[in-house]
Interface confidence: low
């Protein structure tokens, strides 16, 4: 079989920029490094058939199936997909290998299946088979990581039971507060499951896979810090592991730490201590309280005390199922056109929520910030002064929550007019919603001061796009006003706007807009 060409099959993943269906050529896109698909000779097959490793692709992802042929002379080729022939344009790379590509842009269900590539070289004919399927992301999960003590070692293992297998990393920070933000230079990341250095100020473990990233912070009481204005609270669901770290620094080793639950010492096997000397020769002690699987009776005040520091407590609450607590009554806001303003929702939730802000069917990313009192807050400031309905939605594994906001922007009315053979209508979206007057312009009233009250119909309608209100006023045409100029005026506390309409026979109507402040 020495005549057989040396072939290589690769998969190239692209970052999407475009949309199309199978293009049998090279296509300019941003690509990731190629993945070798193996291309092994298929045994017991009639003819020479190579089979590439199966390819799983996310919906809407873009890929290139590529074959590199190391054979002398020219080659010709043909792609076949679902009994249809697709054009094939081989070219040669710098190493003089024949290169054949099939680009699949924005993968859909219809593009999944078997792609057959027939190649004819001067020496031989052969077939290459690619099987492309859509990845079943319905089976995907991303679970919040949790901690376990490593057997016979003073170390923590971080576990996230997720599909596909997640990448686990520890996120460590040794400074206080704001400087421990994710991208801060004070933050150190370690891509490993086991952590031995447990003395840091802030310790988190994060797991990430195709569904995103979830993190769990090691709950810590620092006896050298002033207690918060409200007692720190830790929620857990029945069956989850409990980990609380108590940390204290003292000038020498002459101090000890103890954990108590509701004034009773924790049982042996529910805590372990570690100590080390810091760079300035002070002693750091940490004492972990842990329960491998919590029950309702593990609820209570956990107090860490020291012979040399004021004790501090945390309230651990064990719940049967997760929750989201917040007031869901709708809120209306009225602001000026250039006033700075943010919507905000304050909530208490466990497990941590995923949330979105929505306006006009467009979703915006949602950021959460933990407050000292156990509550979290999400703010939305990116409304660009667009009036309408804004929705905050939050959910976790056990609960969901929705809150509606209405934003009204105070502004002078702007009037638009239209007319038909039988009536004239004016529209305005100013706020507060305007009131209307109609006036007739005649020889007797050249300044259009003669008010029309007959045949006027006002209404308020919801403009669906933004959920904002539009006010309209319609004047039914009567013989008394036909052929005259009429003026509709919308006014509110910020000003008045008018439009003048000539009521004549059907046809295009001239409109003259007046702006009266």
């Amino acid at each position: 079989n020495q005549d057989l060409p040396v072939i290589k099959c690769v998969l190239i993943n692209h970052k999407n920029n475009d949309s199309s269906v199978g293009k049998s050529s090279s296509y300019p896109m941003v690509s990731e490094s190629p993945e070798d698909l193996g291309c092994a000779l298929r045994p017991q097959s009639s003819g020479t058939v190579y089979e590439a490793a199966a390819v799983e692709v996310d919906v809407s992802a873009s890929i290139t199936l590529q074959v590199l042929v190391d054979a002398p002379g020219n080659i010709s080729c043909l792609w076949v997909f679902k009994h249809s022939s697709l054009n094939c344009q081989p070219h040669f790379d710098l190493q003089n290998r024949g290169v054949v590509s099939m680009v699949i842009l924005k993968m859909t269900e219809t593009q999944a299946g078997e792609y057959l590539l027939f190649i004819q070289s001067e020496a031989t004919n052969y077939t290459i088979l690619f099987t492309v399927s859509i990845r079943n992301t319905l089976l995907y999960t991303l679970r919040r990581p949790y901690f376990r003590k490593m057997e016979n070692q003073d170390a923590l293992v971080c576990i996230s039971e997720s599909v596909p297998e997640p990448i686990v990393e520890w996120v460590l920070c040794d400074s206080q507060g704001e400087s421990c933000k994710e991208e801060s230079p004070a933050v150190v990341k370690k891509e490993e499951k086991v952590l031995h250095e447990l003395f840091g100020t802030d310790i988190r473990c994060c797991a990430r896979n195709e569904l995103g990233r979830e993190c769990t912070r090691l709950f810590t009481i620092d006896l050298n810090q002033t207690p918060q204005t409200t007692l720190p609270q830790l929620f857990l669901k029945v069956g989850e592991p409990l980990w609380i770290r108590c940390k204290a620094v003292h000038v020498n080793h002459g101090f000890g730490l103890t954990w108590e639950l509701e004034n009773k010492a924790l049982e042996e096997g529910n805590y372990f201590e570690m100590s080390t000397y810091s760079t300035n020769r002070t002693m750091i002690r940490i004492l972990f309280a842990f329960v491998s699987s919590v029950a309702r009776n593990d609820t209570g005040y956990y107090t860490c005390s020291s012979s040399k520091h004021p004790s501090q407590s945390a309230l651990v609450t064990i719940v049967e199922k997760g929750f989201i607590n917040a007031t869901n009554s709708s809120e209306d806001y009225e602001i000026d056109q250039y006033e700075e303003f943010c919507f905000s929702v304050r909530f208490k939730a466990y497990p941590q929520i995923r949330c979105t802000w929505t306006f006009s069917r467009k979703s915006f990313p949602c950021e959460q910030k933990g407050l000292d009192n156990g509550y979290s807050i999400s703010k939305f400031c990116n409304h660009k002064h667009q009036p309408g309905e804004y929705i905050f939605h939050a959910e976790n594994d056990d609960a969901q929550f929705t809150k509606m906001f209405t934003l009204n922007i105070r502004r002078k009315p702007q009037v638009l007019a239209e007319a038909s053979a039988s009536q004239a209508s004016c529209f305005s979206d100013g706020y507060p919603l305007p009131s209307w007057t109609w006036k007739k312009c005649s020889d007797k009233s050249p300044n259009c001061t003669e008010e029309i009250t007959e045949g006027v119909w006002n209404r308020k309608a919801n403009r669906k796009v933004f959920g904002q209100w539009v006010s309209s006023s319609t004047l039914n045409m009567s013989e008394a006003i036909k052929g005259f100029l009429v003026k509709c005026c919308a006014y509110n506390s910020l000003g008045t706007s008018c439009e003048t309409i000539l009521l004549n026979s059907p046809g295009p109507f001239p409109f003259i807009q007046d702006n009266i402040s």
């Epitope: 918060q228 204005t229 720190p232 309230l315």
Partner: nanobody, 111 residues
Framework: QVQLQESGGGLVQAGGSLRLSCAAS????????MNWYRQAPGKQRESVAW???????NYADSVQGRFTISRDNAKNTVYLQMDNLKPEDTAVYYC?????WGQGTQVTVSS
């Protein structure tokens, strides 16, 4: 919900004494630790002393031997007896327990 109310602060000359009281709205007998903190202008809030339900006490080095903390569970009150006061003891003194803070009482020591 525990509410704490401090009293007894005031202006005193160096070397003088004051007795601060912290009255709790509910029973403190089940509360294990009662604390006094203080905050001087422009400084962090710091621990001064604490007392456990069994009566054991602990003091910051700077007040050791001059201040005495005590509690009366029947009256739901904690006390801080401050003797031989120094100008550096000038601060707002706060009572604290289990996540609850009082409003604070001002102590000013003049030289």
């Amino acid at each position: 919900q525990v509410q704490l109310q401090e009293s007894g602060g005031g202006l005193v000359q160096a070397g003088g004494s004051l007795r601060l009281s912290c009255a709790a709205s509910g029973s403190i007998s089940s509360i294990r630790y009662m604390n006094w903190y203080r905050q001087a202008p422009g400084k962090q809030r710091e621990s001064v002393a604490w007392i456990t339900s069994s009566g054991s006490t602990n003091y910051a080095d700077s007040v050791q031997g001059r201040f005495t903390i005590s509690r009366d569970n029947a009256k739901n009150t904690v006390y801080l007896q401050m003797d031989n006061l120094k100008p550096e003891d000038t601060a707002v003194y706060y009572c604290y327990t289990m996540g609850y803070w009082g409003q604070g009482t001002q102590v000013t020591v003049s030289s």
